[in-house]
């Protein structure tokens, strides 16, 4: 079944990324995204989610890990890790299906 967007009240989340307008944001849920681009160190971004909650269910890969939570500042102290290198047959990126 499709994952429905959250209809609940907004939560306040820690915001730490190049695009944050301040130290916190308000959204339907809080997020932490750990991303490693080719040849670069992993970067961890914290913020708010409002769309596509299905990404929260994606399995961690060697390139990305998504974490979501639903309470006040719940993303503040979360640290994520990436999976070990995958077999060559698997593709990078998490497809939420």
């Amino acid at each position: 079944d499709p994952v429905k967007p959250s209809r609940g009240p907004l939560v306040t989340c820690t915001c730490e990324s190049p695009h944050c307008k301040g130290p916190t944001c308000r959204g339907a849920w809080c997020t932490v995204v750990l991303v490693r681009e080719e040849g670069r160190h992993p970067q961890e971004h914290r913020g708010c989610g409002n769309l596509h909650r299905e990404l929260c269910r994606g399995r961690p890969t060697e390139f990305v890990n998504h974490y979501c939570c639903d309470s006040h500042l719940c993303n503040h102290n979360v640290s994520l890790v990436l999976e070990a290198t995958q077999p060559p047959s698997e593709q990078p990126g998490t497809d939420g299906q």
Epitope: K4, R7, T31, L51, L55, V64, T94, D95
Partner: antibody, heavy 118, light 108 residues
């Protein structure tokens, strides 16, 4: 303001792979507020969503196309790309890219017609 | 997936009249993530309404959206010649994203 522009071959042979790129200007593809989508429209028909990619590289595809679709992102070039494998005449369509946020799909690229023919 | 069914398929009206376009979903859609688009021949779709009832930037106030649950409506209060086009509803924000089949608004 943000603009999107599709590019790629207008003619693809059956059984080959269709490859298109969407270049984003006037804004960053790396913003966590946006999802980057591909949509297509067969001649004289309605709109069909193909899939999206997030700046993190995470994707979600239309189940009807999932086995043939790959969407990727290059944040350094501010581009995202579509690959559709094993194409047939039924994949002839205008292909659009579009930015999605909580206020829907806006803006859209102008669209590019891809014809599948030998 | 959520199937969106638009009605009527074609609507024939004259400039100055009121147009009412319907979009029915196969299951409940969050009104926060229901949009309407206008498309003219040879052009990309243009966002009109998002969140079921909020007008996009630059959209005239003769366009309005309403509804919740499974039923949404786009109303054009007084048709202008440039309003004759195809209109699509869409549910977004959760996947798979789907569009209605479209309503063609033509000059009577």
């Amino acid at each position: 303001q943000v603009q999107l522009q599709e590019s790629g071959p207008g003619l693809v042979k059956p059984s080959q792979t269709l490859s298109l790129t969407c270049t984003v200007s006037g804004g960053s593809i790396s913003s966590g507020d946006y999802y980057w989508n591909w949509i297509r429209q067969h001649p004289g028909k309605g709109l069909e969503w193909i899939g999206y990619i997030y700046y993190s590289g995470s994707t979600y595809y239309n189940p009807s196309l999932k086995s043939r679709v790959t969407i990727s992102v290059d944040t350094s070039k501010n581009q995202f790309s579509l690959k559709l494998s094993s194409v047939t005449a039924a994949d002839t369509a205008v292909y659009y890219c579009a930015r999605e946020d909580i206020a829907g799909f806006d803006p859209w690229g102008q669209g590019t017609l891809v014809t599948v023919s030998s | 997936e959520i199937v969106l069914t638009q009605s009527p398929g074609t609507l024939s009206l004259s400039p100055g009249e009121r147009a009412t376009l319907s979009c029915r979903a196969s299951q409940s859609v969050s009104s926060s993530y229901l949009a309407w688009y206008q498309q003219k021949p040879g052009q990309a779709p243009r966002l009109l309404i998002y969140g079921a009832s909020s007008r996009a930037t630059g959209i005239p106030d003769r366009f309005s959206g309403s509804g919740s649950g499974t039923d949404s409506t786009l109303t054009i209060s007084r048709l202008e010649p440039e309003d004759f086009a195809v209109y699509y509803c869409q549910q977004y924000g959760s996947s798979p994203i789907t569009f209605g089949q479209g309503t063609r608004l033509e000059i009577k």
